[in-house]
Interface confidence: medium
């Protein structure tokens, strides 16, 4: 018979032969042969593989480093990685939760809509027209542009969401 060029789901092609993949939680020890099945072994204590695979090494479980404010949210199994979260009152800096901050800051151009609490992170909002924020802060709201008119001045440079307006003296030549 012709050697296969493609294999079924949960199989892989090696030496012109379809072998079974190892199930999640197990690693490959040896490929199948004409006479033997694929040989797989369970991952060790702190290891995992989360897919049908032909990996010869299991992946290490993620370490939730307490020095970075991390703790284990869900302990890993032979088929799943450990899930880390931050200490109570702290917030992950990314979806992968590799480190923690007490409150996330709002970037320039954004102001704080709601200061963080123990259970919710800082809520930022874009500074609307007429307001600005030139700092990265977890507390500062958007500030209104300076009103040049109330100071008997004129706008010399328009404001943006990140900068205040620049006021200057009135043109004396105007009537």
């Amino acid at each position: 018979p012709e050697p296969p060029t493609a294999c079924r789901e949960k199989q892989y092609l090696i030496n012109s032969q379809c072998c079974s993949l190892c199930q999640p939680g197990q690693k490959l020890v040896s490929d199948c042969t004409e006479f033997t099945e694929t040989e797989c072994l369970p991952c060790g204590e702190s290891e995992f593989l989360d897919t049908w695979n032909r990996e010869t090494h299991c992946h290490q479980h993620k370490y939730c480093d307490p020095n970075l404010g991390l703790r284990v949210q869900q302990k890993g199994t032979s088929e799943t990685d450990t899930i880390c979260t931050c200490e109570e009152g702290w917030h992950c800096t990314s979806e992968a939760c590799e480190s923690c901050v007490l409150h996330r800051s709002c970037s320039p151009g954004f102001g704080v809509k709601q200061i963080a609490t123990g259970v919710s992170d800082t809520i930022c909002e874009p500074c609307p027209v007429g307001f600005f924020s030139n700092v990265s802060s977890a507390f500062e709201k958007c500030h209104p542009w300076t009103s040049c008119e109330t100071k008997d001045l004129v706008v010399q440079q328009a404001g943006t969401n990140k900068t205040d307006v620049v006021c200057g003296p009135q043109d004396r030549l105007r009537a």
């Epitope: 702290w90 901050v101 802060s137 977890a138 507390f139 500062e140």
Partner: nanobody
Framework: EVQLLESGGGLVQPGGSLRLSCAAS????????MQWVRRAPGKGLEWVSA????????YYADSVKGRFTISRDNSKNTLYLQMNSLRAEDTAVYYC?????????WGRGTLVTVSS
């Protein structure tokens, strides 16, 4: 290297006062918001108060509003927390923190015990 050193903690009776200090070095102090956080025995970290770099804007947790006052002296690179009308539930290790930085930039803390 960023260093933060808290001091001023101690044992105080309910209703008493304490003033905590935090000496900062290794960074341009006035550029950063600073804050105080605390950890009560067996509890998580709780944010207490923060202050803007120029010292003009201050922020407080509801639990300490009206009793605690945060301030800073940028010429001395020092952050302060004046604590009045202390209660048993204020017992905690108090830490100062630089900006809203990652977990690394924290002092070792100073223990405040409120007990009769």
């Amino acid at each position: 290297e960023v260093q933060l050193l808290e001091s001023g903690g101690g044992l105080v009776q309910p209703g008493g006062s304490l003033r905590l200090s935090c000496a900062a070095s290794g960074f341009t102090f006035e550029w950063y918001e600073m804050q105080w956080v605390r950890r009560a025995p067996g509890k998580g970290l709780e944010w207490v108060s923060a202050i803007s770099g120029d010292g003009y804007r201050t922020y407080y947790a509801d639990s300490v509003k009206g009793r605690f006052t945060i301030s800073r002296d940028n010429s001395k690179n020092t952050l302060y927390l004046q604590m009045n009308s202390l209660r048993a539930e204020d017992t905690a290790v108090y830490y100062c923190a630089k900006g809203l930085e990652y977990f690394d930039y924290w002092g070792r803390g100073t223990l405040v015990t409120v007990s009769s």
